[in-house]
């Protein structure tokens, strides 16, 4: 006469995070009397998941009614699965005994693998702005995914980047994983409107990758070019001198006029014009009373852009 066998027909079960896992188990006999218990893992440190005899297991429901006479189906459902639930689950028959029930026979185990979506990629750039021709680093992070296999790509304005390094942690087995990637990007003067995109593809995303973006407008600083020009002499011996401040970004800019090294006027860029590439232009002018000067006048347009050291351009005004 054959003694009871515990049959777990599924070697492995794959479930998406948040869903319900069904772990199947049947016994071939009602003998001996005693409960079925489910455990995660084996050995002394195994974790009790369900006990037919006693206890409260709010996430677990039985597939069939275990109070039904002749029931030999001990399958269970575990609700709201998370990556932490991954592991091998054993259906174990116990024999009624005193003072404790005695383990009688175990099923072969079912490995529960949890598919968990990666979190939305977060892209972060350098702490300080950089100027064109400089190389800056961007990082992309995504967490909580399983299984470990994942693909990460970098793009700048739709063009795939190749200069990046990616790590998936931890290296060994884990319930879930994180990805960290650093890409190097060379800035150009036209990058104010550019975007850097980190794209993450994973089996849980059904071919619809997640994207994280960073705007290079947060990273780039385009220093201005200055041009000082003298307009024709106007009535009453007044000369109009203009300072053209071109192609700068961001807008934060302060301009100071100096006459022979002495501060004449300071103003902050306000009514700027925006270029197609996202940079700004601004113009300031100075009316100089020629009759007030006996000698030639050196006019200097000094610009402090975005907290950087001032740049200047001078113009010599002839007094004849």
């Amino acid at each position: 006469e054959e003694e009871l066998q515990v049959i777990q027909p599924d070697k492995s079960v794959l479930v998406a995070a948040g869903e319900t896992a069904t772990l199947r188990c049947t016994a071939t006999s009602l003998i001996p009397v005693g409960p079925i218990q489910w455990f995660r893992g084996a050995g002394p440190g195994r974790e009790l998941i369900y006990n037919q005899k006693e206890g409260h297991f709010p996430r677990v429901t039985t597939v069939s009614d275990l109070t039904k006479r002749n029931n030999m189906d001990f399958s269970i459902r575990i609700g709201n699965i998370t990556p932490a639930d991954a592991g091998t689950y054993y259906c174990v028959k116990f024999r009624k005994g005193s003072p404790d029930d005695v383990e009688f026979k175990s099923g072969a185990g079912t490995e529960l693998s949890v598919r968990a979506k990666p979190s939305a990629p977060v892209v972060s750039g350098p702490a300080a702005r950089a100027t064109p021709q400089h190389t800056v680093s961007f990082t992309c992070e995504s967490h909580g995914f399983s299984p470990r296999d994942i693909t990460l790509k970098w793009f700048k304005n739709g063009n795939e980047l190749s200069d990046f390094q990616t790590n998936v942690d931890p290296v060994g087995e884990s319930v879930s994983y994180s990805i960290h990637s650093t890409a190097k990007v060379v800035l150009t003067r036209e990058d104010v409107h550019s975007q850097v995109i980190c794209e993450v593809a994973h089996v849980t995303l059904q071919g619809d990758p997640l994207r994280g973006t960073a705007n290079l407008s947060e990273t780039i600083r385009v220093p201005p070019t200055l041009e000082v020009t003298q307009q024709p002499v106007r009535a009453e011996n007044q000369v109009n001198v203009t300072c053209q401040v071109r192609k700068f970004y961001p807008q934060r800019l302060q301009l100071t006029w100096l006459e022979n090294g002495n501060v004449s006027r300071t103003e902050t860029a306000s009514t700027v014009t925006e270029n197609k590439d996202g940079t700004y232009n601004w113009m300031s002018w100075l009316l100089v009373n020629v009759s007030a000067h006996r000698d030639d006048v050196k006019l200097t347009c000094q610009v402090e852009h975005d907290g950087q050291p001032a740049v200047s351009k001078s113009h010599d005004l002839k007094v004849s």
Epitope: L4, I31, K96
Partner: antibody, heavy 115, light 111 residues
Framework: RQLVESGGGLVQPGGSLRLSCAAS????????ISWVRQAPGKGLEYIGT?????ITYYASWAKGRFTGSKTSSTAYLQMTSLRAEDTAVYYC????????????WGQGTLVTVSS | DIEMTQSPSSVSASVGDRVTLTCQAS????????LAWYQQKPGQAPKLLIY???TLATGVPSRFSGSGSGTDFTLTISSLQPEDFATYYC???????????FGGGTKVEIK
């Protein structure tokens, strides 16, 4: 689905008897068979349960004198060193208790121990 | 070993009455629910009514119900029918698989 007992009768004190319990309509392979007796005018008394070869157990008072066995279709209860107080109707029932209760019962067979 | 005590030993009742029988264990039964109720009529084998303390056996009328846990259990017949006059036994199981003991029985008689 039924259980039919046989083998009861008159036996002298110190004698032996083997009761049979034949199942029809179901196999005994995955079920325990329990034996219960009832002395005339008295209540029910659990004797023991026959599961598989390694799984048989008996009430403390029955150990030693009562031995059970079964095939897929018939269960047996071997009784030795019988005494007058063993006089009773002997029932077999399908089940092992707890979540496997005694749901099918035989009609009973009378064992009389007397000289 | 576990001991099972049924009370009362007999009860007289009329058809339509609500009847409550009690069974007390000397210690908690196995799993707090290893308690079954059987009905026996003269000259017949016992019949399973309730198992696991409160689960109604197949084919048993719903007027029978079981309750209780641990050491104290009851069998209730909500509206006694003529065919219910019989003796009722509880069977309790202790922690050891061989520790199955019947109570002394309660006879339900016609008043």
């Amino acid at each position: 689905r039924q259980l039919v007992e046989s083998g009861g009768g008159l036996v002298q004190p110190g004698g032996s008897l083997r009761l049979s319990c034949a199942a029809s309509g179901f196999s005994l392979s995955s079920h325990g068979i329990s034996w219960v007796r009832q002395a005339p005018g008295k209540g029910l008394e659990y004797i023991g349960t026959i599961g598989t070869g390694v799984i048989t157990y008996y009430a403390s008072w029955a150990k030693g004198r009562f031995t059970g066995s079964k095939t897929s279709s018939t269960a047996y209860l071997q009784m030795t060193s019988l005494r007058a107080e063993d006089t009773a109707v002997y029932y077999c029932a399908r089940g092992s208790a707890w979540n496997d209760p005694f749901d099918y019962w035989g009609q009973g067979t009378l064992v009389t121990v007397s000289s | 070993d576990i001991e099972m005590t049924q009370s009362p030993s007999s009860v007289s009742a009329s058809v339509g009455d609500r009847v409550t029988l009690t069974c007390q264990a000397s210690q908690s039964v196995y799993g707090n629910n290893d308690l079954a109720w059987y009905q026996q009529k003269p000259g017949q084998a016992p019949k399973l009514l309730i198992y696991l303390a409160s689960t109604l056996a197949t084919g048993v009328p719903s007027r029978f119900s079981g309750s209780g846990s641990g050491t104290d259990f009851t069998l209730t017949i909500s509206s006694l029918q003529p065919e219910d006059f019989a003796t009722y036994y509880c069977l309790g199981g202790g922690d050891d698989e061989a520790d199955n003991v019947f109570g002394g029985g309660t006879k339900v008689e016609i008043k």
